[in-house]
């Protein structure tokens, strides 16, 4: 079986703070799964991208957000199977010829995703066909199921592209999280912060912002680049000593409605300890089962 | 083109119960769900409910949760809605819409009489 | 359940003039993840089918006259035709889709 969570290429070890992220080689991030949605049953045709991350060779995990239908109305509705592409072992968005592409064969968003306050904010796609795992596509662990998620201060990474398209406009951009700098995949490192202190930031903001427990949140306090560079659904890893592996711990979920990298503006993740009996649950097919690998 | 197509206007007597259609085409039916719409005669518009075709989920106003009963049929493309235990309080023109109320059907009319 | 309310419940206006009508919800429409307002603005003419004008609050749907115009955010909303034509009689609802649906007791437009 292939190993989680272990890249081919080590992770450089990053003791300082990142500012406006950069440039992952190939090869860095190899679970880094590019989701492109074209829904052509929407009045005029959308298109929106979003990361995810593989868990096995049939299975993505992202964001149920970037796999939600864009609609008018606030009702949850997954995008149909064959509106969505998956592209892996990519580094460039411009060249997509050493990447492997996918379609889907099945869309799962978690059933009480809530559109109001993003709460269970995580998806699954299962792979038409089994991908080919290599140097450059290899999955990611799972963490252990509890409800602590990581730790304050633990450091974590997460890399995104950000297609920047001059065509799409502010509120797409912002719907699909698609705020980066490259079409190289970046990435950043980011500290987790204390569920107390995210909360507190964003219960002072106007609006309906709820940090719940199936969150976490992770930035720095001053500011900075460092939070725009995530693509929504993109796993935030951790690694974990004990194991030697890289473990999704969280899927980039939102922000505030600020600039990103404003003061006290904290990224929002998918808490995934939160969920893996159900992600197990959904990819309990015996190929799935099989191929899934958790952190133990 | 899409169009919805409704069933005829229905004349009921009190106490009985009715299945009105909305035929779908010219757009994949189960990728978008299906609203139905009361309007009682000069009077304004109120939604009773939608359902979902790719997975029969469904979801009420809950005025209308013991009086509508929404079905699909994904093999004719064809939503329906059941009206039960019908009172002169159900005399309307009830809409079927679809593609995020892009496309409406042409109504029925059903009226309730002894 | 949400309650919106329209203003006012009827007017008539010569063509050519500008008339604006609003709509009041009891709370709050604008989803602050999507960054959109739940709110739709429908016409309605006699013996005819609703038609769908704006969505999102301000989003005019594909081949809408640019005559209507959709504004407002939070609570209140409001629709304004610049320039009013014969063809505009109809009855206008707006609903929001925040939560569920709901519909607004509509504005019925005259023309004098």
């Known amino acids: 079986l292939p190993v989680c969570g272990q890249p081919s290429r080590a992770l450089p070890n990053l003791v300082k703070r990142i500012i406006g992220g950069r440039n992952a080689e190939l090869g860095l991030f190899p679970w880094q799964a590019l989701i492109v949605v074209e829904d052509t049953s929407r009045i005029p045709n959308d298109k929106w991208f979003g990361s995810g991350a593989l868990l096995s060779e049939s299975w993505i995990l992202t964001a149920a957000h970037v796999l939600r239908s864009q609609r008018r109305d606030n009702t949850v509705i997954p995008v149909s199977k064959d509106h969505v592409t998956v592209y892996l072992g990519l580094h460039d968005v411009r060249d997509k010829s050493g990447a492997v592409n996918s379609s889907a064969a099945r869309v799962v968003l978690h059933p009480d995703f809530n559109i109001q306050n993003y709460n269970h904010d995580i998806a699954l796609v299962q792979l038409q066909e089994p991908v080919p795992l290599g140097a450059h596509v290899m999955p990611i662990c799972l963490p252990r199921p509890e409800p602590e998620g990581p730790a304050p201060h633990m450091l974590g990474l997460v890399a995104g592209w950000g297609i920047s398209n001059p065509n799409v406009t502010v509120d797409e951009i912002i719907i699909s999280g698609t705020r980066t700098l490259s079409d190289v995949l970046q990435y950043v490192k980011l500290p987790v912060v204390s569920h107390a202190e995210c909360k507190a930031s964003y219960e002072s903001r106007s609006g309906n912002y709820s940090v719940t427990e199936n969150m976490f949140c992770a930035g720095y306090y001053e500011g900075g680049k460092d939070t725009c560079l995530g693509d929504s659904g993109g796993a935030f890893v951790i690694f974990d000593e004990m194991s030697q592996r890289w473990v999704a711990q969280g899927l980039v979920s939102w922000g505030g409605p600020e600039e990103c990298g404003s003061k006290q503006v904290y990224g929002v993740y998918t808490k995934v300890s939160n969920y893996v009996d159900w992600l197990l649950e959904e990819m309990n097919s015996p190929r799935g089962v099989r191929e899934l690998q958790v952190e133990r | 083109q899409v169009q919805l197509k409704q069933s005829g206007p229905e004349l009921v007597k009190p106490g009985a119960s009715v299945k009105l259609s909305c035929k779908a085409s010219g757009y994949t039916f189960t990728t978008d769900d299906i609203n139905w719409v009361k309007q009682r005669p000069g009077q304004g518009l109120e939604w009773i409910g939608w359902?979902?075709?790719?997975?029969?989920?469904?979801k009420y106003n809950d005025k209308f949760k013991d009086k509508a009963t929404l079905t699909v049929d994904t093999s004719s493309n064809t939503a329906y809605m059941d009206l039960h235990s019908l009172t002169s309080e159900d005399s309307a023109v009830y809409f079927c819409s679809s593609l995020e109320d892009t496309y409406w059907g042409q109504g029925t009319l059903v009226a309730v009489s002894s | 359940d949400i309650v919106m309310t329209q203003s006012p419940s009827s007017l008539a206006v010569s063509a050519g003039e500008k008339v604006t009508m609003t709509c009041k919800s009891s709370?709050?429409?604008?989803?602050?993840?999507?960054?959109?307002?739940?709110l739709a603005w429908y016409q309605q003419k006699p013996g005819q089918s609703p038609k769908l004008l704006i969505y999102w609050a301000s989003t005019r749907e594909s081949g809408v006259p640019d005559r209507f115009t959709g504004s407002g955010s939070g609570t209140d909303f409001s629709l304004t035709i610049s320039s009013v034509q014969a063809e505009d009689l109809a009855v206008y609802y707006c609903k929001q889709s925040y939560n569920l649906y709901t519909f607004g007791g509509g504005t019925k437009l005259e023309i004098k």
């Open positions: 359902i979902y075709p790719r997975d029969d989920r469904t």
């Open positions: 709370q709050s429409l604008l989803n602050s993840r999507t960054r959109k307002n739940y």
